[in-house]
């Protein structure tokens, strides 16, 4: 008679996580009596998967009854597949003794699993940068198999080019990880973009999961100053105005200078909002002339986001205007864009 | 198709080093473990070392701890054996050859082979 | 360590002979037996696994058997390309360990 052969029909199975595999395996003889014996791997370091006579696998079931006399078909389902499943099995039969002894391998199935990917993160640099320069962004993505994926960036919509991919570990590896950064250069206008990290893969069946950072979170514009003289409001009385223009973030603090010496500051609280998401805000200054005998200058000066103060100074021309008798106070009248002190 | 290609033949006087490598094709280097067997001049062959190339870890046979380093160096797909103090026992062919397995934890037979180095260590 | 035994260090051959090498572990290994074949200058080539799994794109003259701890490999139809040097490896424990060979020759 021919001498048994075991036969494992499938070179290799993929397999979603989560799902179970089915592993074939058939001898094609009944003798010798003895049990069959699954095993990840050979060599001192295979494991067993599953001992038809003994043992507990709460994960494997046999595909047919393997307890009836004539059975010859020893396929096994292992189910909740995880990417830590992958590897070649062998069915073997042993020979019934004491102890059973080994007496043929099948050629061996090797298995691997398919996983997803986990939703892209994305972050940006830790400290905001100003338009004109270029920032980096990364995108992470854990647990995916097999190692085969594609990453793209976007802008608003448009697609990306210079960005570095990276995909650990370099070797086989149960799962993976995918690894990108992208360089993205600021203007003034991107406080309302977006960038979009997007990755493309076997188990995601064409709908390819997205990552998102706002820019809002990463840019600084600096606000642009105009300081200018208002007619003048009362007599003896000059409003002065500082325009602070296209600003973002909202943080920022002024303080009006006269003559270098602080007369107030403030923090910018109503503020408009322009279309493209920067800011305005306006803060004016109601002076005396009259207390004044030289010119003043005053300066408006802003801390925006934690910033070096930037300033603009207007020149108050004192000899134009009659000089009241005794007046001591500077600038009594002082105010802003939402309240009037007089 | 997978290759494995070894450096060159080295000639080397007792007491000396050499270091000599094994570079991987074809397949992806960290898929499959790597082994370095030893075959001195019209003898057998003597398995020396298992690399885990995932890892890193060594396996090695009793008769060659010490003087022996096996290193890596994953970005070049490469194996290297360094031989320390060299003795004219060590004359031999040296041979790296590849696990079966791709998921490579369990070490068995050998499928690919290098062409072998022959080491010569004569004063 | 596992000793693996060649007892035959050398085999005459006539071309179209069936062939019988034969390995013997100095203790039980199961069916963790390969077999490769070697030529001067060559490196060697693996023939058999698991005792009796014919490695892809070995001709089917070449057959493994046994298990325990007495292996053989048969030539079923002896060409003049088999003539070689035939070592068998156990991997059922660590070291691995290699036969000495046993090398076949012609009449």
């Known amino acids: 008679e021919e001498e048994l052969q075991v036969i494992q029909p499938d070179k290799s199975v993929s397999v979603a996580a989560g799902e179970s595999a089915i592993l074939h395996c058939t001898v094609t003889s009944l003798i010798p009596v003895g049990p069959i014996q699954w095993f990840r791997g050979a060599g001192p370091a295979r494991e067993l998967i599953y001992n038809q006579k003994e043992g507990h696998f709460p994960r494997v079931t046999t595909v047919s009854e393997s307890t009836k006399r004539e059975n010859m078909d020893f396929s096994i389902s292992i189910s909740n597949i995880t990417p830590a499943d992958a590897g070649t099995y062998y069915c073997v039969k042993f020979r019934k003794g004491s102890p059973d002894t080994e007496f043929k391998s099948g050629a061996g199935t090797e298995l691997s699993v398919r996983a997803k990917p986990s939703a892209p993160v994305v972050s940006g640099p830790a400290a905001r940068a100003t338009p004109q320069h270029t920032v980096s962004f990364t995108c992470e993505s854990h647990g995916f198999s097999p190692r085969d994926i594609t990453l793209k960036w976007f802008k608003n919509g448009n697609e990306l080019s210079d960005f570095q991919t990276n995909v650990d570990p370099v070797g086989e590896s149960v799962s993976y990880s995918i690894h990108s950064t992208a360089k993205v250069v600021l203007t003034r206008e991107d406080v309302h973009s977006q960038v979009i990290c997007e990755v493309a893969h076997v188990t995601l069946q064409g709908d390819p999961l997205r990552g998102t950072a706002n820019l809002s979170e990463t840019i600084r514009v600096p606000p642009t100053l105009e300081v200018t003289q208002q007619p003048v409001r009362a007599e003896n009385q000059v409003n002065v105005t500082c325009q602070v223009r296209k600003f973002y973030p909202q943080r920022l603090q002024l303080t009006w200078l006269e003559n270098g010496n602080v007369s107030r500051t403030e923090t910018a609280s109503t503020v408009t909002e322009n279309k493209d998401g920067t800011y305005n805000w306006m803060s004016w200054l109601l002076v005396n002339v009259s207390a004044h005998r030289d010119d003043v200058k005053l300066t408006c000066q802003v801390e925006h986001d934690g910033q070096p103060a930037v300033s603009k100074s207007h020149d108050l021309k004192v000899s134009a205007h009659p000089k009241e008798q005794g007046s001591n106070t500077a600038a009594e009248n002082t105010g802003s864009n939402e309240r009037n002190i007089y | 198709q997978i290759q494995l290609v070894q450096s060159g033949p080295e000639l080397k006087k007792p007491g000396e080093t050499v270091k000599i490598s094994c570079k991987a094709s074809?397949?992806?280097?960290?898929?499959?473990?790597m082994s370095w067997v030893k075959q001195a001049p019209g003898k057998g062959l003597k398995w020396m070392v298992w690399i885990n190339t995932y890892s890193g870890v060594p396996t090695y046979a009793d008769d060659f701890k010490g003087r022996f380093a096996f290193s890596l160096e994953t970005s070049a797909s490469t194996s290297y054996l360094q031989i320390n103090n060299l003795k004219n026992e060590d004359t031999a062919t040296y041979f790296c050859?590849?696990?079966?397995?791709?998921?490579?934890?369990?070490?068995?037979?050998?499928?690919?082979w290098g062409q072998g180095t022959l080491v010569t260590v004569s004063a | 360590d596992i000793v693996m035994t060649q007892s035959q260090k050398f085999m005459s051959t006539t071309i179209g002979d069936r062939v019988s090498i034969t390995c013997e572990a100095s203790q039980i290994v199961g069916i963790a037996v390969a077999w490769y074949q070697q030529k001067p200058g060559q490196s060697p080539k693996l023939l058999i696994y698991?005792?009796?799994n014919r490695y892809t794109g070995v001709p089917d003259r070449f057959t493994g058997s046994g298990s325990g701890t007495d292996f053989t490999l048969t030539i079923s139809n002896m060409q003049s390309e088999d003539l070689a040097n035939y070592f068998c490896q156990q991997y059922s424990a660590y070291p691995f360990t290699f036969g000495s060979g046993t090398k076949l020759e012609v009449k």
């Open positions: 074809g397949y992806t280097f960290t898929t499959y473990g």
């Open positions: 698991s005792a009796s």
């Open positions: 050859a590849r696990d079966p397995h791709y998921y490579g934890s369990s070490p068995a037979w050998f499928v690919y």
